[in-house]
């Protein structure tokens, strides 16, 4: 009976529940448009289960299709500010290894102060995701306004 | 041997496929910025599988990491209206128990009439999520324009 | 022995990991507001695992609750263009079978040049999803700016 019940079961590990939700740590120095992320329970509601951070960039540990999502809010911003500083653009992409470098997700702020989006994309073990914010405006570090995450969806 | 192996496996039910998608019922009375939600097949394409509604607010029944998503469209709105009534802000947060109260997701409308976003966050059984819309503008009740949902992702 | 072991696990297929991420192929001829999609590894990072394309529209192959997401960026666009061509609206809906025709997701561009959103919705085998872009503005074909996808979440 117990064995029959076990028939319907699935090894937990093989579900590949890799998931991460990060909060903004800081922006890069001049000429470095990357955002630097941090995560972990000590920091609040951010976490990494599987993926890792490498110098503030997210590195994937398991091959598969992932849902990648991001929200970035500009810190001192009104629709006037946003349009005056246009173009302010956010791009999420694979930045290493260089052979796999590609832009996955791109959004411009235009007259808004927040962008938010998500997409499904294949990622491979070792892929490092970078989030580039071009323009002079500063992103908010509030954890409910700026965040970045990935969720493994299927092999 | 076979039984020991089965131990490491997981009953399908315990995958925790908790999920809900809600449609707007109504806004709160004055001084109550909360949106009140409703769900169920009789209402159209909204549903609750696991989570429950408690006086129009969503209560979580299973611990885990959830993908929370929301879209809110303002009802009588143009970019002029939106900027004139600025700031109109939507915040999604845990509102009870009070000890776990926190803002999870925050967006302002600026010159737009729709906000949409999503994020991963840990939620615990008993957490109630509230969605607060500040400002004088009214949200659309159209089910394709305003909705709020959660999806259990992993333990 | 190997077969007996397999008994205890859940066939990968039965998890219903249906998923698709599509890139824009082209817009429709005049009087046809539909966007026509394409997908497959030869095209880059788009793919179909389960769902199929039928004349550029996405057809569902498995009943269940799906996460539907979309991002559309207008090609030659500034906040001025967007407001001058207002209303430019994107709607995602079930367009066939006719008996199940319904709008699932609707967003207007107002003064922005990108819309992005997602929602959970029940879909049935045979449902075809259409994405209608009304207005005269052209969507970007860049794969990081315009994409449309679905992910099976639960039965």
């Amino acid at each position: 009976q117990r064995f029959a019940q076990a028939q319907q079961q699935l090894p937990l590990e093989s579900l590949g529940w890799d998931v991460a939700e990060l909060q903004l740590n800081h922006t890069g120095p001049q000429q470095d448009p990357r955002l630097y992320w941090q995560g972990g329970p000590a920091l609040g509601r951010s976490f990494l289960h599987g993926p890792e951070l490498d110098k503030g960039q997210l590195r994937i540990h398991r091959d598969g299709i992932y849902m990648v999502h991001i929200q970035v809010t500009l810190a001192i911003c009104s629709s006037t500010t946003a349009s005056r500083h246009h173009p302010t653009t956010l791009a999420v992409g694979i930045c290493s290894p260089a052979s796999r470098s590609i832009s996955l997700l791109r959004l411009s702020f235009h007259q808004g102060c927040t962008i938010a989006s998500q997409r499904l994309t294949p990622l491979a073990r070792g892929d490092t995701l970078c989030t580039n914010l071009t323009g002079t405006l500063l992103p908010s570090r509030n954890t409910d306004e700026t965040f970045f995450g990935v969720q493994w969806v299927r092999p | 041997q076979r039984f020991a192996q089965a131990q490491q496996q997981l009953p399908l039910e315990s995958l925790g496929w908790d999920v809900a998608e809600l449609q707007l019922n109504h806004t709160g009375p004055q001084q109550d910025p909360r949106l009140y939600w409703q769900g169920g097949p009789a209402l159209g394409r909204s549903f609750l599988h696991g989570p429950e509604l408690d006086k129009g607010q969503l209560r979580i029944h299973r611990d885990g990491i959830y993908m929370v998503h929301i879209q809110v469209t303002l009802a009588i709105c143009s970019s002029t209206t939106a900027s004139r009534h600025h700031p109109t802000t939507l915040a999604v947060g845990i509102c009870s128990p009070a000890s776990r109260s926190i803002s999870l997701l925050r967006l302002s409308f600026h010159q737009g009439c729709t906000i949409a976003s999503q994020r991963l966050t840990p939620l615990a059984r008993g957490d109630t999520l509230c969605t607060n819309l500040t400002g004088t503008l009214l949200p659309s009740r159209n089910t394709d324009e305003t909705f709020f949902g959660v999806q259990w992702v992993r333990p | 022995q190997r077969f007996a072991q397999a008994q205890q696990q859940l066939p990968l297929e039965s998890l219903g990991w249906d998923v698709a991420e599509l890139q824009l192929n082209h817009t429709g001829p005049q009087q046809d507001p539909r966007l026509y999609w394409q997908g497959g590894p030869a095209l880059g990072r788009s793919f179909l695992h389960g769902p199929e394309l039928d004349k550029g529209q996405l057809r569902i192959h498995r009943d269940g609750i799906y996460m539907v997401h979309i991002q559309v960026t207008l090609a030659i666009c500034s906040s001025t263009t967007a407001s001058r061509h207002h209303p430019t609206t994107l709607a995602v809906g079930i367009c066939s079978p006719a008996s199940r025709s319904i709008s699932l997701l609707r967003l207007s561009f107002h003064q922005g040049c990108t819309i992005a959103s997602q929602r959970l919705t029940p879909l049935a085998r045979g449902d075809t999803l259409c994405t209608n872009l009304t207005g005269t503005l052209l969507p970007s074909r860049n794969t990081d700016e315009t994409f449309f996808g679905v992910q099976w979440v639960r039965p």
């Epitope: 173009p87 791009a91 470098s101 071009t134 | - | 082209h26 817009t27 052209l138 970007s140 074909r141």
Partner: antibody, heavy 120, light 107 residues
Framework: QVQLQESGPGLVKPSQTLSLTCTVS??????????WSWIRQPPGKCLEWIGY???????DYNPSLKSRVTISVDTSKNQFSLKLSSVTAADTAVYYC????????????WGQGTLVTVSS | DIQMTQSPSSLSASVGDRVTISCRAS??????FNWYQQKPGKAPKVLIY???SLQSGVPSRFSGSGSGTEFTLTISSLQPEDFATYYC?????????FGCGTKVEIK
Amino acid sequence: QVQLQESGPGLVKPSQTLSLTCTVSGDSIISGGYYWSWIRQPPGKCLEWIGYIFYSGSTDYNPSLKSRVTISVDTSKNQFSLKLSSVTAADTAVYYCARSGYSYALFDAWGQGTLVTVSS
Amino acid sequence: DIQMTQSPSSLSASVGDRVTISCRASQFIGRYFNWYQQKPGKAPKVLIYAESSLQSGVPSRFSGSGSGTEFTLTISSLQPEDFATYYCQQSYSTPWTFGCGTKVEIK
């Protein structure tokens, strides 16, 4: 108002490498809203797109020239450059640098063009 | 690559004439299509983008239409400053390609 200006030698010997630089003023390459292209036009002939570069350094080249072309960017100088190796007389053309939107390939700003002659 | 074939390669017309220039794409490109004008010794200049949208500052006598593979540029009443070479270009996929031009000369 964005302006583009090509510079480089007007005469290159066959089998050598053609090198041109485009200096951008009135817009910052690093702002990230545009692709920066090279386009050429042999005397009395068609326009041919050579390739583009983005501020990040990512490139795309015309397959017909890909094996010989390198486009690079120097964001600190607000410049991008073209190198075309192993040139022949068929590479004699007016070379233009141009800007196109990221979201749509419309060449809305051009340099005035520079004639490069390949001859010994 | 997508080939763009322009016709005619040249035409003679008088001031006030209605002029049409055609361009055919070797495959369907939807509305991802543009027209440019080039005068001798100058760089090309955008006239029409996205098949039928008039670039800012371009006179309304210029108009564009198309069907996904066949495109037409129309000058409703030719003016002296319109004598030039006109190029079509596809923005559907890289490599971006141009037609070989139509030279509009004075009759």
